[in-house]
């Protein structure tokens, strides 16, 4: 069977496969997808590896029509380096020469520079080009190699392996070498894999069953990090409680050297943020940290400096810390909108059982706000969801230049963010360079501020306008009509009417079900409009959701089924890829992200159209 | 490097007690299994009794019932206590365990042996 990392290489002209007969002749041979020696893999950015032989696809000089054949991998060789060009060419690096399928007389695999059919080939059974299953870098934990990537094929008591391998060891321990030989260069480390035993590698908080892993040994990147973590179904380690704090400045007592956390205001227009989405509700800053150099835009654990946090340049080398299992955040169970019939006052806006309200002219204290929004049934705006503050941006009449208290505070506990009516933290979204925080300004309070209603913390005696919130009435006489300039069974989001397509349908069914229905495939404008969609369909319980967008007219470039212009993205992780296809909104914990799928998976849709009545706005000059 | 060290091996008449103890110190991250095999005068080295770091144990079937395998995780160290002793027991005991170690991706280490007689 084939590894998900293993492919044959499938040239549709002649309909047949590339097969490394012997490491000398790489040829053709009509496709078995069981037959070793039409498997392939990439081991590097730019290597090709037979798994028959663990060696790899290379020329002995980069010239016009020399023979490809299989040589010991070696990474710094130039003669081993491929990449894939326009569309489905494969080319040595760098030169305009090709994988080319040879000819009548040349029965092996050669290096030509001409580009017509026979140069062109793409994964068996797909239509992806070879670099759609490119190589993933494998980071290693403890070991000798400070956590470097492994090295596949590396050689072992002179067996080449290119794989994890438990060899050596007798209690089945996944390792691999970080060079090609380890024989010589003796540099190893242990793979971030499922095996008995590796959940040792954790260290598990049992007042709340997380899970940590500190590899103080590595030395990465950031991004290598996260990375790592990832590889193993985890996150770079965020903090929002301070038991859990405690707990880390306990498991890291020993340690001197800093570690990479998930702490990182890599987002252009936002401000501090964690990795794994946690809110940034609690702050445990090194004194003169956060600097606002730029540039320092991830942030490292200090254990030597009772394990508080300092802000540096994301391309430092460090160690690390992950973490997996219940997230810290308590559970707390947020209504979808349409859960919830919502009956508000006059002058009150209903949004998810709630009612809300923007006091902009009186301007007051965040205390006497608080009091007022009190005095009225409610509180100062707790926000909990995206979709809660598109709703409150988007329909709540909120202006660009306004600066609004909400709830939330940190006057109870210093550097420890509550909301003011007592829901648990469970959002975020701080404008860039906040929460500031500055020690010499007792910045206690939130606001709401800026085009996009991104929070900064505030001195709570600046007086201001206010958003209130309160539970809605189970029933009352003033039911907004919401669905107004919509057909039955469409939901009405600004100027337009959506609708949940229930049949399982291809891409081009579904097009064609909402073009009968006088709409279109959904297109997907700003980060809105996508949050709206999120809740919509987010949790439900089908696994995606067609939008209009697809590559398939331009392969590599994204179009919207009526040709509107694509002015914003929501891809999900390693997407779009380099894979073509048409795309689809994921439900579930990836609520919304955009998968890329194959057209003719059958999936439900999302059809929308300018509501009734509504008048179209100009269309943006360019 | 990593080192195992036995110790409590001995003389005992049939029937007797003896308890073998084994401390791993060194460049240890952890040990997955720990365990105890014997080799008597021309004859191949055997197990005797292993136990996970999880504590599952599995024994020879000649030694089941008389012998116990214990460790305390936290000092590295097994033990073996050997009750209803035989003359077919007398052999060099040796200690075995599977560490990961920070230098090598070899596993398995083994002690000297200590020396364990059943006679009277």
């Known amino acids: 069977l084939l590894d998900t990392r293993q492919f044959l290489i499938y040239n549709e002209d002649h309909k047949r496969c590339v097969d490394a007969v012997s490491p000398s002749a790489v040829q053709t041979a009509a496709c078995n997808q069981d037959a070793e020696s039409q498997k392939f893999r990439w081991v590097s950015e730019s290597q090709i590896m037979s798994v028959a032989f663990k060696l790899c696809l290379g020329v002995p000089s980069k010239t016009d029509w020399v023979a490809i054949t299989l040589y010991a991998c070696d990474s710094k060789s130039e003669f081993q380096k491929w990449e894939c060009k326009n569309d489905t060419l494969l080319g040595i690096k760098g030169e305009d020469l090709f994988f080319n399928y040879g000819n009548r007389q040349e029965k092996n695999i050669m290096l030509y520079k001409g580009s017509g059919l026979w140069s062109r080939w793409k994964i068996y059974g797909t239509t992806d080009n070879l670099c759609s299953r490119g190589y993933e870098a494998m980071y290693t934990l403890l070991g000798n190699a400070n956590g470097a990537t492994c090295a596949f094929p590396f050689k072992f008591e002179n067996k080449w392996y290119a794989d994890c391998t438990s060899a050596g060891r007798s209690d089945g321990w996944l390792w691999c070498g970080t060079t090609t030989d380890y024989d010589t260069d003796k540099l190893f480390g242990y793979c971030p894999l499922k095996f008995e035993g590796s959940e040792s590698l954790w260290n598990k908080d049992p007042l709340t069953s997380v899970s940590y892993q500190i590899n103080s040994k590595s030395a990465l990147t950031w991004h290598q990090a996260r990375k790592s973590c990832q590889q193993q179904n985890a996150e770079l380690l965020s903090i929002t409680e301070i038991h859990e704090q405690t707990y880390l400045t306990g498991l890291t007592s020993s340690l001197t050297s800093g570690l990479w956390i998930g702490l990182n205001s890599l987002s252009f227009n936002s401000g501090w943020q964690w990795s794994d989405r946690s809110p940034f509700r609690y702050l445990n800053w090194l004194p003169g940290s956060p600097s606002a150099e730029p540039g320092k835009s991830c942030v490292s654990l200090n254990p030597g400096k009772n394990a508080k946090w300092e802000n540096l340049e994301c391309v430092q080398k460090l160690g690390y810390i992950c973490k997996k299992g219940n997230t810290t955040l308590n559970s707390f169970v947020i209504p979808s909108e349409s859960d919830v019939p919502t009956h508000c006052p006059s002058q009150w806006w209903p949004y998810a059982g709630h009612c809300y309200k923007i006091h902009r002219d009186e301007k007051k204290i965040q205390r006497d706000a608080l009091t007022t929004c009190r005095k009225e049934g409610g509180d100062l705006t707790s926000i909990h969801t995206i979709e809660e503050l598109d709703f409150i941006i988007s329909q709540l009449g909120y202006e660009p230049n306004d600066e609004l208290w909400i709830g939330l505070n940190d006057i109870k506990i210093q550097m420890y963010f509550e909301w003011s009516d007592g829901t648990p933290v469970t959002f975020t979204k701080w404008l860039r360079g906040e929460p500031s925080h500055e020690n010499n300004r007792q910045e206690d309070c939130v606001v709401m501020k800026g085009k996009d209603g991104y929070w900064a913390d505030r001195g709570c005696e600046w007086p201001l306008g206010y958003i209130c919130k309160m539970k809605s009435r189970s029933q009352g006489p003033e039911i907004v009509e919401v669905e107004k300039g919509c057909r039955k069974g469409w939901k009405k989001h600004h100027f337009y009417c959506y609708m949940i397509g229930h049949t399982l349908s291809t891409f081009a069914e579904a097009n064609q079900t909402c073009n009968n229905e006088n709409a279109y495939l959904t297109t997907i404008e700003d980060r809105y409009e996508q949050a709206f969609l999120t809740s919509f369909v987010g949790l439900r319980p089908e696994k995606y959701f067609w939008t209009g967008l697809s590559d398939i007219q331009t392969k590599g470039t994204f179009q919207w089924t009526i040709e509107e212009e694509v002015r914003f993205t929501h891809w999900n992780s390693d997407m779009p890829g380099r894979k073509p296809g048409c795309v689809a909104m994921r439900t579930g914990i990836a609520g919304g992200l955009w998968d890329v799928l194959k057209c003719d998976e059958k999936a439900k849709f999302v059809c929308k159209h300018w509501a009734e009545g509504v008048t179209h706005p100009p269309k943006p000059t360019t | 490097q990593v080192q195992l060290q036995e110790s409590g091996g001995g003389l005992v008449q049939p029937g007797g007690s003896l308890m073998l103890s084994c401390a791993a110190s060194?460049?240890?991250?952890?040990?997955?299994?720990m365990g105890w095999y014997r080799q008597a005068p021309g004859k191949q080295r055997e197990l005797v009794a292993a136990i996970t770091s999880g504590g599952n144990t599995n024994y020879a079937d000649s030694v089941k019932g008389r012998f116990t395998i214990s460790r305390d995780n936290a000092k590295n160290t097994v033990y073996l206590q050997m009750n209803s002793l035989k003359p077919e027991d007398t052999a060099v005991y040796y200690c075995?365990?599977?560490?990961?170690?920070?230098?090598?991706?070899?596993?398995?280490?083994w002690g000297q042996g200590t020396q364990v007689t059943v006679s009277s």
């Open positions: 075995n365990a599977a560490i990961v170690t920070m230098t090598s991706p070899y596993s398995d280490y």
């Open positions: 060194g460049n240890i991250f952890t040990i997955n299994r």
